[in-house]
Amino acid sequence: AQEVQQSPHCTTVPVGASVNITCSTSGGLRGIYLRQLGPQPQDIIYYEDGVVPTTDRRFRGRIDFSGSQDNLTITMHRLQLSDTGTYTCQAITEVNVYGSGTLVLVTEEQSQGWHRCSDAPPRASALPAPPTGSALPDPQTASALPDPPAASALP
């Protein structure tokens, strides 16, 4: 079965820094979402080879991509405290397949010592019933809620 390998599990970064999240699959994708989890899940990007990526307005101008949809590294720049949260990759194949999630902790520089990642993957605090066409459920964890998206159709 198709899987999504996602790394890192957790990262602690100061305000203004950057973070890399990598989503790797064995191929055969139509595209991949990076989603910030929470009571109101929030798409950050949708990436499909050969198509201009869709990026949420909150991250426009501070997202870079490298690689292809099968092995994609997403770099989020100039992180803000409100970017703290759990981000998961959703690969679109004939079913939905989810990564294990990346917990991003954005901290004030002086409080770096207070917030550290453990080695464990991020904990999903509440799991909804998985969509029937999904390889894994879409975990929900509390996070800062972003502004509503302003992404629209791609040609």
Epitope: R30, G31, Y33, R35, Q36, P39, Q40, P41, Q42, D43, I44, Y46, T54, D56, I92, T93, E94, V95, N96, P128, A129, P130, P131, T132, G133, S134, P137, D138, Q140, P148, P149, A151, S152, A153, L154
Partner: antibody
Framework: EVQLVESGGGLVKPGGSLKLSCAAS????????MSWVRQTPEKRLEWVAS???????YYPDSVKGRFTISRDNARNILYLQMSSLRSEDTAMYYC???????????WGAGTTVTVS | DIQMTQTTSSLSASLGDRVTISCSAS??????LNWYQQKPDGTVKLLIY???SLHSGVPSRFSGSGSGTDYSLTISNLEPEDIATYYC?????????FGGGTKLEIK
């Protein structure tokens, strides 16, 4: 059992506006993408709009800039705001659960929109 | 946009018959093809997704096949409740597009 119930259809003049609603039950609404599909009087099916579970929206060129899809995860409701309506928008409008980016596995019974 | 064509707009068959409905795409769609059934009352149901996967609750007399640009839906043993219009739909690329439908009637 998953149920989708559309409402808000009616008769509207060209250039007018209408807002359709789709109430969902029996599913974890926030975990699913949702779509609107319409059926013309000639019985052709046309995809109208989609919204991913994370809020990205997608439209065909025929409605882009005139229609807006949105969702209220707290109330389990999907919306379609239609403006600058044209006679060619006359159709039965269905909402559907979008299981995997275009695979529409549950449909509502539809609501009729007439632009005349 | 990808155009979906169902060349047969209506089809008449007898109960118990094996019926095949065809659908072709204007370019390859990598098996991202669904089949829907619309009953005379307007109710729409998904029958087959990803070319050949039977949706839950759909009788096993329905099957799908195909690849590239050419796809088909087969009903192996026609029953009265199968009277409906059948639509194919591609979901390989936006915008999602549907065939014109094939109306199935009983002889």
């Amino acid at each position: 059992e998953v149920q989708l119930v559309e409402s808000g259809g009616g008769l509207v003049k060209p250039g007018g506006s209408l807002k359709l609603s789709c109430a969902a039950s029996g599913l974890t609404f926030s975990s699913y993408a949702m779509s609107w599909v319409r059926q013309t009087p000639e019985k052709r099916l046309e995809w109208v709009a989609s919204i991913s579970s994370g809020g990205f929206t997608y439209y065909p060129d025929s409605v882009k800039g005139r229609f807006t899809i949105s969702r209220d995860n707290a109330r389990n409701i999907l919306y379609l705001q239609m403006s600058s309506l044209r006679s060619e928008d006359t159709a039965m409008y269905y909402c559907a659960r979008d299981e995997v980016r275009g695979y529409l596995d549950v449909w509502g019974a539809g609501t009729t929109v007439t632009v005349s | 946009d990808i155009q979906m064509t169902q060349t047969t707009s209506s089809l008449s068959a007898s109960l118990g018959d094996r019926v095949t409905i065809s659908c072709s795409a204007s370019q390859g769609i990598s098996n991202y093809l669904n089949w829907y059934q619309q009953k005379p009352d307007g109710t729409v149901k998904l029958l087959i997704y990803y070319t050949s996967s039977l949706h839950s609750g759909v009788p096993s007399r329905f099957s799908g096949s195909g690849s590239g640009t050419d796809y088909s839906l087969t009903i192996s043993n026609l029953e009265p409740e199968d009277i409906a219009t059948y639509y194919c739909q591609q979901y390989s690329k936006l915008p999602y597009t549907f065939g014109g439908g094939t109306k199935l009637e009983i002889k």
